[in-house]
Amino acid sequence: ARPRTELLNVCMDAKHHKEKPSPEDGLHKQCSPWKKNSCCFANTSREAHKDISYLYRFNWNHCGSMTPACKKHFIQDTCLYECSPNLGPWIQEVNQSWRKERILHVPLCKEDCEQWWQDCRTSYTCKSNWHKGWNWTSGYNQCPEGAACHPFHFYFPTSAALCSEIWSHSYKVSNYSRGSGRCIQMWFDPAQGNPNEEVARFYARAMS
């Protein structure tokens, strides 16, 4: 884990992140809320909106076409991961070829998980952990042999299951609500400021 002095306004040491957060004017569409202070470059933000982008060669449409309503949550999830300078309290060292740090147990506001889960109910997948177990032989992820495509709710029976399991417990569902100052919002209106700054401060204090 990081020294307790380095929990606020930091970028993780991963594949595409800046070394330090800074303003980034040209952030694309759903990543634009982070433009005042960002860990991602403009080009990363553009790639976050593409299918099978160069970022991770990840195929959202591995079980047929993912609905736009569902896909926008995965784009937002990517924007949060790549751009947020407010995830310091949950950064952990990791021994992986493609990154030195990851996030673990970020307390996502319960409404963000609920909305994600509801909007993906008509989309299909074949796995509950999207970090591992894929067939990458084609250069992008495909369902492994024997993994059947089912609606999201089959692999993620609750919103909590979706948020906690999909990326190896990078997230957990908070009992707190949006606006409480105690949970991270994947979605926010930058006109009203970035609510995750206060959340990071709260947990950084709690950890010190």
């Epitope: 926008k72 319960k110 609920e114 509801q118 979605w187």
Partner: nanobody, 130 residues
Framework: QVQLVESGGGSVQTGGSPRLSCAVS????????MGWFRQAPGKEREGVAG???????????YYADSVKGRFTISQDNAQRTVYLQMNSLKPEDTAMYYC????????????????????WGQGTQVTVSS
């Protein structure tokens, strides 16, 4: 302060499909959270559907389990109106239906919480008879 005017209620048969409308004035409509709520006699007001109208990815909608698959909330930016299309109505859907709005960015179950809203319409009665 946002002004809201509902219309479209009335008496319908079981299985009917009325559409409620909520006209918005007094606010730049592009970024609002709006909800449809209902209150039957002797019962608490409950959220049935909500929509966040703004943001870089377009509107986001959320539904109570009791109406999922039967009701659809939508918006018409040009008309500054939010609609609730109600299908396959049942007698237990009988209630006064209210439209509510707030400038807060609400999603998920937050869209269905009455305490989150600061502007309310007068309501329109929907009566479902068998």
């Amino acid at each position: 302060q946002v002004q809201l005017v509902e219309s479209g209620g009335g008496s319908v048969q079981t299985g009917g499909s009325p559409r409620l409308s909520c006209a918005v004035s007094g606010h730049t409509y592009s970024r609002l959270s709006m909800g449809w709520f209902r209150q039957a006699p002797g019962k608490e007001r409950e959220g049935v559907a909500g929509i966040y109208t703004g943001g870089p990815s377009g509107p986001m909608t959320y539904y109570a389990d009791s109406v999922k698959g039967r009701f659809t909330i939508s918006q018409d930016n040009a008309q500054r109106t939010v609609y609730l299309q109600m299908n396959s109505l049942k007698p237990e859907d009988t209630a006064m239906y209210y439209c509510a709005a707030t400038p807060q960015f609400l999603i998920g179950s937050g869209l269905l919480r009455p305490d989150k809203y600061n502007s309310w319409g007068q309501g329109t009665q929907v009566t479902v008879s068998s």
